[in-house]
């Protein structure tokens, strides 16, 4: 493995981030801020890239399947949480094919820096970004009910995940800004229902002194839906998503123990978001390193079961966006908001003062997150350790409670190349495909002077396609030294978050 120039691998970094976003099933698109480190290894006619990417969350849901730099500027009237992250990524390119990059695995850590960037002095407006978004499910449900009244085709949608909640308090009143995903949970599973996934942004306004959040003075909601048929591979052509042996990606936060515990701190007990699970693997995942395959006939129809509201038809590919409201927009946070008049006179700009979120349990008096060598936890164990390879892969959504016998997958470590892997309509374990690749850990918010802890780098070994020795792993341990010509430059427009990234890595 040799160090390489960070600027030389920019196309790979940009494409890799697109593929990572494509694998994620909840949250917001990552945008590339900087290539922090880059190494590569050549194995026969395949190049293996080891990349460290500094990212920032946009305001576009991953469900939009947009390219990360096609995310439009955010609605200036809504507060935009600033969440940064760092991803360690292993990707491969076969035979210098200019279109063909595959992401093998990735680990990301993310954290909100909104509070750390807040300047609470001399401002009549206070903004909170809540970590415990679940508390606001009622508001999301209320907003969705209103939307259903105006949009018949949303009748069978239910709230899935509450993604972000912000509160803006000023002299004119209090506004809650709730972003959430929705899923279609029809009573009848056949024929397959369109528009299975959606993303909504609700703005609820209250009087200044209002204690009752049940009755907003004003409620505005915009939703967009994503057509599952657009996610499917036509003619059985497999998606070009990367590694043939693993598929999917899920975001996870530790719910049993905190993923990172700084010196002298106690556990963070605020609830974390549930695991993000990927959809079933595509019907055919043979490797296609020598160019994309030719069409091979229609894919098998998977029953669109909502028994656990899995991503049964949410294939690997994109989503057609249907906006249900002219003023709904895809958002991203890194441009300064224009000073438009917000309803009730608020100016909920991302760079406005933020009050520390009172519902977060900040461990007081702990040191800034240090540069832990190799991403190790200061107490000697990895802060973001992989879960064991065998997970319960059921993705219980809002439609039905999980069945009693929750199958677990412990049937080997994936099928040999060329074997089909299908997920049934929601019952029992997956017979192969144990390990879902890729993880995103949400850490507690950073405070001034802290830096984002590095993601772990202990990726499991993988064989490369068409390799002469398929049983011999081809990836090297993720490099711990830093390439001399790294990190790269921050993309323009992100100067305020650079202080939260480590500028040098452990040698």
């Amino acid at each position: 493995v040799s160090p390489t120039d960070c600027s030389a691998v920019e196309p790979e970094a940009e494409k890799a981030l697109d593929l990572i976003n494509k694998r994620r099933r909840d949250g917001y698109l990552f945008q590339l801020l900087r290539i922090a480190d880059a190494h590569l290894d050549r194995v026969e006619n395949t190049t293996v890239y080891y990349l460290v990417l500094d990212v920032q969350e946009s305001d576009c849901s991953v469900l939009s399947r947009k390219y990360w730099n096609d995310c439009e500027p955010p609605d200036s009237r809504r507060p935009s949480e600033i969440v940064i992250g760092q991803c360690k990524v292993i990707a491969t390119r076969h035979s210098h094919e200019s279109q063909d990059l595959r992401v093998i695995d990735f680990n990301c850590t993310t954290s909100s820096v909104s509070s750390a960037l807040a300047n609470t002095k001399d401002s009549p407006v206070l903004i909170d970004f809540f970590e415990d978004t679940e508390r606001y499910r009622k508001q999301a449900n209320k907003a969705l009910e209103k939307y259903k009244e105006e949009n018949d085709d949303f009748a069978s949608f239910r709230v899935d995940r509450i993604e972000r909640v912000a509160r803006v308090r000023g002299g004119e009143g209090t506004g809650y800004f709730v972003d959430f995903s929705v899923r279609n949970c029809p009573r009848h599973h056949f024929p397959r229902h369109p528009n299975v996934f959606g993303f909504c942004r609700a703005d609820l306004f209250y009087d200044v002194e209002a204690l009752d959040l049940e009755s907003p003075k004003n409620l505005v909601i915009n939703c967009e839906v994503f057509d599952p048929q657009e996610h499917e591979n036509i003619n059985g052509v497999p998606p070009h998503l990367g590694h043939p042996f693993h598929w999917g990606g899920h975001e996870r936060s530790s719910t049993t123990k905190p993923p990172f515990k700084p010196h002298g701190s106690r556990d963070h007990h605020h609830p974390h978001k549930p695991h993000e699970h990927g959809p079933p693997p595509p019907p055919d995942e043979r490797d296609h390193s020598h160019g994309p395959p030719l069409p091979q006939g229609p894919p098998p129809l998977l029953p669109m079961s909502c028994s656990s509201c899995q991503h049964a038809t949410f294939g690997t590919n994109g989503a057609q966006r249907h906006s249900h409201n002219n003023n709904s927009s895809d958002l991203h946070p890194h441009k300064h908001h224009s000073h438009e008049q917000h309803p009730h006179g608020h100016h909920p700009h991302a760079h406005h003062p933020h009050e520390h979120d009172t519902h977060r349990q900040h461990p007081h008096g702990h040191h800034p997150h240090g540069h832990h060598p190799h991403g190790h936890h200061p107490h000697g164990h990895h802060p973001h350790g992989h879960h064991p390879h065998c997970h319960d892969f059921q993705d219980y959504g809002p439609c039905d409670p999980p069945p009693h016998n929750q199958g677990h997958c412990c049937h080997g470590h994936g099928p040999p190349p060329g074997h089909l892997r299908r997920r049934g309509p929601g019952k029992g374990p997956r017979p192969f495909h144990c390990r879902q690749i890729g993880s995103v850990y949400r850490l507690p918010p950073l405070r001034k002077g802290e830096v984002l802890p590095l993601p772990e780098a202990n990726f499991p070994s993988f064989p490369l396609p068409h390799h002469k020795h398929p049983l011999k792993p081809d990836n090297q341990p993720f490099p711990q030294s830093v390439s001399e010509s790294c990190p790269g430059k921050f993309k323009s427009g992100f100067p305020q978050v650079s202080m939260f990234f480590t500028h040098t890595f452990p040698k």
Partner: antibody, heavy 119, light 106 residues
């Protein structure tokens, strides 16, 4: 490998709409990549018009934004260009092309189709 | 928009020659410079992407170099099949193309 083929009328009257189809073989347009339209005016000047991505999101050249629409039919693995209110200035050879990531580079091109705008 | 300028609109060279075609951007394009060959029949092929990377199937006699605003394409050993028009294109922002350089054999 990816192959692209443009088709559509070779003659369009001014003020009408120009409609072209790009049929893709060897790869699903919903799997990855951005699917672009590029045109070449008489005299060789090339102009990027816009794309539809694997996900269905679109991005257009600002100079054409009010007149252009790129759509797709995933069941046929085709994507389409519609250019409204054409004038003789829109006479060009129209190419469809695939790009790995947005429009950073265009890896595969169709053979091009000449469209003449004339009465 | 970023303007791309190919100052030489046509050039002729002998078989076996080393030919260099240049391209200048109106601002820094961070190496997102690509080269295409258009044959007399109109077919277009990507040759070089991201300044210096050879697209698959392109002969190794083609190479690219440059940085910032100035870039060049070199054909080290001109062959008959290399006749055509060569275009540069920047992909750093909304794409724009150079005016083309027509290459003929003496």
């Amino acid at each position: 490998e990816v192959q692209l083929q443009e088709s559509g009328p070779g003659l369009v009257k001014p003020s009408q709409s120009l409609s072209l189809t790009c049929t893709v073989t060897g790869y699903s347009i919903t799997s990855d990549y951005a699917w672009n339209w590029i045109r070449q005016f008489p005299g060789n000047k090339l102009e990027w018009m816009g794309y539809i991505s694997y996900s269905g999101s679109t991005n257009y050249n600002p100079s054409l934004k009010s007149r252009i629409s790129i759509t797709r039919d995933t069941s046929k693995n085709q994507f389409f260009l519609q250019l409204n209110s054409v004038t003789t200035e829109d006479t060009a050879t129209y190419y469809c092309a695939s790009a790995s990531y947005r429009y950073a580079w265009f890896a595969y091109w169709g053979q091009g189709t000449l469209v003449t705008v004339s009465t | 928009d970023i303007q791309m300028t190919q100052t030489t609109s046509s050039l002729s060279a002998s078989l076996g020659d080393r030919v260099t075609i240049s391209c200048r951007a109106s601002q820094d394009i961070s190496n997102y410079l690509n080269w295409y060959q258009q044959k007399p029949d109109g077919t277009v092929k990507l040759l070089i992407y991201y300044t210096s990377r050879l697209h698959s199937g392109v002969p190794s006699r083609f190479s690219g170099s440059g940085s910032g605003t100035d870039y060049s394409l070199t054909i080290s050993n001109l062959e008959q099949e290399d006749i055509g028009t060569y275009f540069c294109q920047q992909g750093n922002t909304l794409p724009t193309f150079g005016g083309g350089t027509k290459l003929e054999i003496k």
